[in-house]
Interface confidence: low
Amino acid sequence: VTGSRVYPANEVTLLDSRSVQGELGWIASPLEGGWEEVSIMDEKNTPIRTYQVCNVMEPSQNNWLRTDWITREGAQRVYIEIKFTLRDCNSLPGVMGTCKETFNLYYYESDNDKERFIRENQFVKIDTIAADESFTQVDIGDRIMKLNTEIRDVGPLSKKGFYLAFQDVGACIALVSVRVFYKKCPLTVRNLAQFPDTITGADTSSLVEVRGSCVNNSEEKDVPKMYCGADGEWLVPIGNCLCNAGHEERSGECQACKIGYYKALSTDATCAKCPPHSYSVWEGATSCTCDRGFFRADNDAASMPCTRPPSAPLNLISNVNETSVNLEWSSPQNTGGRQDISYNVVCKKCGAGDPSKCRPCGSGVHYTPQQNGLKTTKVSITDLLAHTNYTFEIWAVNGVSKYNPNPDQSVSVTVTTNQAAPSSIALVQAKEVTRYSVALAWLEPDRPNGVILEYEVKYYEKDQNERSYRIVRTAARNTDIKGLNPLTSYVFHVRARTAAGYGDFSEPLEVTTNTVPSRIIGDGANST
């Protein structure tokens, strides 16, 4: 059973004779008359087990003491610390020539932990140990022990373990403590990288390169490395780790950002307070959640405040010029905290009777400079239909408008374009043909461009070729042309008129009157 004693963090003890409770029971040769296990009191009046020998009167002493087997635990170099007292030969009368003031230290590597005998020829000498300070009998009486401490190292070791041996050649010695240890560079954290316990190298000048592993909640920036020196000290830190997003360095650890703070990236920065209009409710936030009604655009940095869609543009005015409209407006009162404001124009064509029945204007309408993404506060809209109700909406948008489920940031105006001459009539038909008359009917123009005041029918005999024609006017979309000659080809044209003037004539309709007194009903464009 071993009691614990405190040693430096970079030393790992393999054997400590002072921590052993009860007898050490090491092997001595010879079994008697040489090294003897003796209990004495240490400087704190605690009993400790020592080995003593004091055969200073007899010549040719060769007394061996061997430890139990000591495991090496992967160490390539071990250190032996011996605390001992050595009697000054001058203080012992009549021993000149036989008294010595040194002893020898040996080791023997072995995979066998049960070797029962000392075979001197197997042991390799480490060193001859001499006292720096010897003691006299008086010192013991005063309960003051004058201890010598010597440390030796041995390596490289390769087998599972080893034995130590002490050879006395005629000295008066008490081995008070034997400690065997190896050195390690203790587990440490540098630059947020953890370096494990690392056993030092085989020789006293070697450096062991060790790769560190990033502490919890961190990642490598540059590969973290350090060198473990032979004395158990870490040297030359290289590379480092950075705290992950949502964590910052505190006391050598990567700790989660506190509530109300965040960190978006793996950097050496500290957590930042949530930007305006945002919050975090969990520790370790990598971004802050926008307050209700506030948003963050895809390309907004996490450090930017959350922003809102803009309010509606102000002061929309319109100027109608025939089938064109110029619109101008002012910027919104509230831009939502963003610079990237632009405007979109929505054009709707609305019925005169029911303004709520509106349809998109379609692709025939043109916008200058453009319909969407306007950076200016004016737009010119052309190629509208005449005499038509239009509603124009101007939408203010910014980088977060698309996130708003209930947009209300538009202003609208309804205008009516001026009347214009109507378009031509697409279809004229001869509904009834007799010997002396033709009944005509036609469709309203595709684009009346105003209120149709009347229709004008122009007709002439085909062989006259428009040299001599007649005009009939009517408000209806049909008329009977009478007083025609039988069996004669006539050409008919129809056009419409609004307050703005006449439209173009329709394509010619050719009709031949009948010779027989019966009616021919026709509905084509040309009746014969």
Partner: antibody, heavy 124, light 107 residues
Amino acid sequence: QVQLVQSGSELKKPGASVKVSCKASGYTFTDYSMHWVRQAPGQGLKWMGWINTETGEPTYAQGFTGRFVFSLDTSVSTAYLQISSLKAEDTAVYYCARIPLYYYGSRYWYFDVWGQGTTVTVSS
Amino acid sequence: DIQMTQSPSSLSASVGDRVTITCRASENIYRNLAWYQQKPGKAPQLLLYAATNLADGVPSRFSGSGSGTDYTLTISSLQPEDFATYYCQHFWGTPWTFGQGTKVEIK
């Protein structure tokens, strides 16, 4: 009025599974996260974790990972707690409780509405 | 994890008594504390939040105080319907732990 109504008591054998439902009414389901709290017989309350009703993302407290699953059906405003490989020590009353997903001026959380609790008994 | 320690674990009192229950957090929770009342076979009910704010519909005889790590729930004049178990709960960093409860019994 605002209420959370939980499914009825369950008696299960060890190793079986159970699914507890918590139906919300009287408010917009996705405006509040749903939390689960366990109370073993004669014991205190233990927070198990929560589910984000907007994204469906669950968060489990330590000791409630693996066998415990939080889920949603937003179409019927209902949150679910499923426990698999039931053990005798899962015998408890399980409560759902809500917390606003967003801040509305106040920066403090609290469970303002609780379900009536569902007793789950695990016995062979 | 933050530990919440409630004291006493139980107490006996009479109608009209002033009752005080304390809750100590293992670290500063910055007033992120709620108090709940639970009656046998029922779900807990919110009494106070943010350490001192009275929840809707809770009688004014209930009050809360405290900051940092030490918080108190006080019932100024105990009523028959107040005999129940009371729990504190923190909301400062997950997991959100509850105190072990204080049972208020009739003397």
